[in-house]
C-alpha cells in the first residue's frame, strides 16, 4: 500500500517516509511544507527581532512539533490549535483510530488482526525485517552487528548476509580458518594470531613461516678483524682474534694489554665476547 503522508502535506515541497509524516524539501518549512524558508522568519508577527537579520524570529507556536498524530494536519486557532484528521482517525489529536483491517493499514506484508480494546481497532503483526504500528519501518538488522571478526553485514531483505574478511568463514564469519589451533611452530617458535592468518614468532636463529628455516645471525659478518661469529641460541657471539677485544672485536689491544681507546668500555676485557 502507498504511504499515507500527513493530510495537506505539500505534494511539491514535502514527502514522507512513514505514515503521517510531512518532511520538507530544502528551502521549504512549516507543518505542511508550504512556507519558503527565505521569508518564513520575516513573515511571522510574533517573536523577538533577530540581531543578525533584522527579521522577527518566530517564537514557539501551538502547532510546533505537530501535536496531531497519525498524519493529522495542524492549524492554529486564536486560542490553541485544531487537528484535521485523515480518514479513519479522530479525536483532539487524531489519536483515536477508526481504521479497521478492511482499510488495509498494515504495510510490507504485515498481517492485520482486529484489536481487542476500543482504543485499538487493529493490530499489525509485522513480517521479519519490519516494525512499527503499521509495519512501516524497516528494521536495520545490521545495527545488531551480527557479523563477527570484522565481517561486512548486508541486509538483503529476505535474508542477512555476512561478507567475511580473509581468513574467516561461516554464516556470521565466526570460524577462524587459519588460527593457531593445531598449528605448530618449529624450533621453539610461538604461534601468533592476527588478521585471520597464523604467524610464527620464531626463536633466535630461525625464520620462515613455521620457523623451520635456520636464519644465520652471523651472515652479516658482525665480528670485526677476523673475529669468529657463533649463532648461539642466546644471541650471536663473537670470539675475537688475538689482539682484538669488544663485543664485536672492534677494539685493538696494544702489546702492553691496553686498548687503543683512551679508556676501554666498562666490562670489556681483551678478547671479550658479546654478552
Amino acid at each position: 500500500a502507498p504511504l499515507v503522508c500527513r493530510a495537506g502535506c505539500s505534494p511539491e515541497h514535502g514527502f514522507c517516509e512513514q505514515p503521517g509524516e510531512c518532511r520538507c524539501l530544502e528551502g521549504w518549512t512549516g507543518p505542511l511544507c508550504t512556507v519558503p524558508v527565505s521569508t518564513s522568519s520575516c513573515l511571522s508577527p510574533r517573536g523577538p527581532s533577530s540581531a543578525t537579520t533584522g527579521c522577527l524570529v518566530p517564537g514557539p507556536g501551538p502547532c510546533d512539533g505537530n501535536p496531531c498524530a497519525n498524519g493529522g494536519s495542524c492549524s492554529e486557532t486564536p486560542r490553541s490549535f485544531e487537528c484535521t484528521c485523515p480518514r479513519g482517525f479522530y479525536g483532539l489529536r487524531c489519536e483515536v483510530s477508526g481504521v479497521t483491517c478492511a482499510d488495509g493499514p498494515c504495510f510490507n506484508g504485515g498481517l492485520c488482526v482486529g484489536g481487542a480494546d476500543p482504543d485499538s481497532a487493529y493490530i499489525c503483526h509485522c513480517p521479519p525485517g519490519f516494525q512499527g504500528s503499521n509495519c512501516e519501518k524497516r528494521v536495520d538488522r545490521c545495527s545488531l552487528q551480527p557479523c563477527r571478526n570484522g565481517g561486512l553485514c548486508l541486509d538483503l531483505g529476505h535474508a542477512l548476509r555476512c561478507r567475511c574478511r580473509a581468513g574467516f568463514a561461516g554464516p556470521r564469519c565466526e570460524h577462524d580458518l587459519d588460527d593457531c589451533a593445531g598449528r605448530a611452530c618449529a624450533n621453539g617458535g610461538t604461534c601468533v594470531e592476527g588478521g585471520g592468518a597464523h604467524r610464527c614468532s620464531c626463536a633466535l636463529g630461525f625464520g620462515g613461516r613455521d620457523c623451520r628455516e635456520r636464519a644465520d645471525p652471523c651472515a652479516a659478518r658482525p665480528c670485526a678483524h677476523g673475529g669468529r661469529c657463533y649463532a648461539h641460541f642466546s644471541g650471536l657471539v663473537c670470539a675475537c682474534a688475538p689482539g682484538y677485544m669488544g663485543a664485536r672485536c672492534e677494539f685493538p689491544v696494544h702489546p702492553d694489554g691496553a686498548s687503543a681507546l683512551p679508556a676501554a668500555p666498562p666490562g670489556l676485557r681483551p678478547g671479550d665476547p658479546q654478552r
Epitope: C218, Y230, L236, A239, D272
Partner: antibody
Framework: QEQLVESGGGLVQPEGSLTLTCTAS?????????MCWVRQAPGKGPEWIAC???????TDYASWAKGRFTVSKASSTTVTLQMTSLAVADTATYFC???????????WGPGTLVTVSS | QVLTQTPSPVSAAVGGTVTISCQST????????LSWYQQKPGQPPKVLIY???NLEIGVPSRFKGSGSGTQFTLTISGAQCDDAATYYC??????????FGGGTEVVVK
C-alpha cells in the same frame, strides 16, 4: 632434531691412514659453527684434536695434531677428519662435536671407535 | 693451556654436596669461557654449565658453576644417585684453542 653421527672408524694398522666422516642432520653448516673432532682413549679424558669454522672454512689444530690430522668440510652437512701415520696411541673413540658459541660443545655424536693395532 | 681438576675421585652421600675444582694455566677467553661436562660410560660428554656459570637448558638446578679467569668450581648440591659419573672442565682460549681437564670421578653412596 639436531644430530651428529660419526662413521669410518675401525681397525687400522700402525702407520696406516683413515678418514672419519661426521654427518649432521636437523641443521646444516650454512650457519656459523666450529665443527670439531675430539677423541677419548679408553679410561682417559677427552682430548681436542681440531675444528673447522663453517663461517669461512678456517681450521685450528691442537699443537700435537698438526701435520698428521686434517679437518675439512666435504659438504653442507658433512665434515671429515683425515688421519695419517697412525700409532697405537691414537686408539680412541673419536667424537664429532659442535661449538655454537661461548666455546663449549653443546652437541656431540655418539662416537666411532678407531683401533690402531698390528 | 693445561686444565687441572681436583680431587679425584670424590665421594658423597645422597643429598650431600660435591665440589670439584678446575684450574687453568692461563686465563680462558673472556675470563669465563669455561664449561663443565658430565660423562657416563659408553656415552659422549653432556654439557652442564657453559660460560662458567650458565646452566644449560634441561640441566637440574642442583648443578652450579662459578669462578673466572683461571680458577673455576662445579658444585652439586643435594647429590642424587644419577649424578654418579665423571665430570670434566673444558676451556676455550684466545686463538681458538680448546682444552679439557683430566676429569673427576664422582661416587654417590
Amino acid at each position: 632434531q639436531e644430530q651428529l653421527v660419526e662413521s669410518g672408524g675401525g681397525l687400522v694398522q700402525p702407520e696406516g691412514s683413515l678418514t672419519l666422516t661426521c654427518t649432521a642432520s636437523g641443521f646444516s653448516f650454512s650457519s656459523s659453527y666450529d665443527m670439531c673432532w675430539v677423541r677419548q682413549a679408553p679410561g682417559k679424558g677427552p682430548e681436542w684434536i681440531a675444528c673447522i669454522y663453517t663461517g669461512d672454512g678456517s681450521t685450528d689444530y691442537a699443537s700435537w695434531a698438526k701435520g698428521r690430522f686434517t679437518v675439512s668440510k666435504a659438504s653442507s652437512t658433512t665434515v671429515t677428519l683425515q688421519m695419517t701415520s697412525l700409532a697405537v696411541a691414537d686408539t680412541a673413540t673419536y667424537f664429532c662435536a659442535r661449538n655454537s658459541g661461548y666455546g663449549y660443545f653443546g652437541l656431540w655424536g655418539p662416537g666411532t671407535l678407531v683401533t690402531v693395532s698390528s | 693451556q693445561v686444565l687441572t681438576q681436583t680431587p679425584s675421585p670424590v665421594s658423597a652421600a645422597v643429598g650431600g654436596t660435591v665440589t670439584i675444582s678446575c684450574q687453568s694455566t692461563e686465563s680462558v677467553y673472556g675470563s669465563d669461557w669455561l664449561s663443565w661436562y658430565q660423562q657416563k660410560p659408553g656415552q659422549p660428554p653432556k654439557v652442564l654449565i657453559y660460560q662458567a656459570s650458565n646452566l644449560e637448558i634441561g640441566v637440574p638446578s642442583r648443578f652450579k658453576g662459578s669462578g673466572s679467569g683461571t680458577q673455576f668450581t662445579l658444585t652439586i648440591s643435594g647429590a642424587q644417585c644419577d649424578d654418579a659419573a665423571t665430570y670434566y672442565c673444558q676451556g676455550y682460549y684466545s686463538g681458538y684453542i680448546y682444552a679439557f681437564g683430566g676429569g673427576t670421578e664422582v661416587v654417590v653412596k
